[in-house]
Interface confidence: low
Amino acid sequence: RAPRCRELPAQKWWHTGALYRIGDLQAFQGHGAGNLAGLKGRLDYLSSLKVKGLVLGPIHKNQKDDVAQTDLLQIDPNFGSKEDFDSLLQSAKKKSIRVILDLTPNYRGENSWFSTQVDTVATKVKDALEFWLQAGVDGFQVRDIENLKDASSFLAEWQNITKGFSEDRLLIAGTNSSDLQQILSLLESNKDLLLTSSYLSDSGSTGEHTKSLVTQYLNATGNRWCSWSLSQARLLTSFLPAQLLRLYQLMLFTLPGTPVFSYGDEIGLDAAALPGQPMEAPVMLWDESSFPDIPGAVSANMTVKGQSEDPGSLLSLFRRLSDQRSKERSLLHGDFHAFSAGPGLFSYIRHWDQNERFLVVLNFGDVGLSAGLQASDLPASASLPAKADLLLSTQPGREEGSPLELERLKLEPHEGLLLRFPYAA
């Protein structure tokens, strides 16, 4: 008799794939554009990334550091009108892309939360939540909550409004903190909150350190749903050298939780390579004309257009991983088990019931390594086979689909492997 199937967990839409942040509409669209109507024209691109949600803005009226001239119910005319926003929402829904609105109040100013008028601002946020929920948004993001006095109680209140409207609505909070205890205290008081932080931002050093950070976080948060990113707003290239971008893409897409990316992460957008561009929001490189300030500074392989045509590009890897993440049960909601694989390496298994299983092996080091996979670290329900099929490597040159002997697994410097193997009773 076949064993009984494990009951599927309830899956919210943000459990099914990545979120994509567009914090600066103008930088995202470039060429002096940067409005809601223009963003609507980029939704097909977002669809091609298979992201599940777009975290947009802030786009509300905000005169720097002036509470009276900050209106969370009004769209800044530079970005368009309420009609433009409604049209964007409808188009996004047709493409199954959810829209999350950033309501961080004083986004143009020094202190995101007008530190001296917290109560006034909190009331404005409550009003705005109601207003935009009625308008049809799928969720909200508030950032820099370390600057918000009594953040936990305000977040709980906002969560009640959001969830009270619909269980299918999401609240994301962002913090610059990388301190696990601070992060946990915010999470404790808010059951369904998705929190982005800088927790992983200094993880780029070694596989052991990354493994330690990830497992500590998962152990501390128990069975609650996590999000994975390196910060609340910034690009991966702000924290990582180019050679680790692929590795991190693979890791963020295969850890249990929602991966959250900023626009440009999919192409390795790097402000440092674009003289004069702001670190926090460089212009998106759609093609070589996107950064005309210094002709020749942008080569095709740095752009969406160039990378779209290259199956070995970072963008192509992102699309493949995003696709796998959104359709494989073991990656959608599977159990996670990390285990030892040797110095410099971080490896783990994702598995769900009798579905196809996944093995991830990441070499953070700059030397090639043989992986000594310690299967004894794994529970019986997650045992390793002798061979697994290579689904993809972050480095070119491996024959995909070929079975690899796990005892003889060798990884190139900064290489990550995603392998698959069947459930065996």
């Epitope: 002096g32 070589e288 004309s289 002709p295 020749g296 752009t303």
Partner: antibody, heavy 119, light 106 residues
Framework: EVQLQESGPSLVKPSQTLSLTCSVT????????WNWIRKFPGNKLEYMGY???????YYNPSLKSRVSITRDTSKNQYYLQLNSVTTEDTATYYC?????????????WGQGTLVTVSA | QIVLTQSPAIMSASPGEKVTISCSAS?????MYWFQQKPGSSPKPWIY???ILASGVPDRFSGSGSGTSYSLTISSMEAEDAATYYC?????????FGAGTKLELK
Amino acid sequence: EVQLQESGPSLVKPSQTLSLTCSVTGDSITSGYWNWIRKFPGNKLEYMGYISYSGRTYYNPSLKSRVSITRDTSKNQYYLQLNSVTTEDTATYYCQRHVIYDYTWFAYWGQGTLVTVSA
Amino acid sequence: QIVLTQSPAIMSASPGEKVTISCSASSSVHYMYWFQQKPGSSPKPWIYRTSILASGVPDRFSGSGSGTSYSLTISSMEAEDAATYYCQQYQSYPLTFGAGTKLELK
């Protein structure tokens, strides 16, 4: 087809101002970058500066205090002014438009106009 | 600014001979661009992104290089190839050119 045509006096006296016009057909100067480049008698090429689609300008630091590039979008023309010229400014002056877009490179040049600086 | 040093300044080659013109940059550039100019004419785009031939350029021409060292090669010299060749960088402003290599037919 994009065509650029330089015009202006061929002889300028030292200390005076050199003024040239570039008339553009087949493209609008409100898109892209529009350059002035000069070629000295010994064949050396020097990039002088640009005026962009938005009207923003860039000047070669070696000329900065003396050079000015302006435009008239209604005539689809852009202009070069070089003040306080000396005999060292004798050269063939070219207006030029370059387009670098993915795997495309266009560089449209005028035919050049020889300007001699002499008393 | 990025200084481009071309060598040789002048050279002559017999028909059928292989020709190589070098261009060295004072700091690293992504790509090199090459123009051809003949007396009485404007410069013509010849090779772009280091190695891609512009439209109408014969395939006996090729370009190569990376970082600070680039070259233009003619596999077999023909009379019509006699001209001055300039390298140019689009990496940073001010845009700069090499001093040119005058290629004559021997």
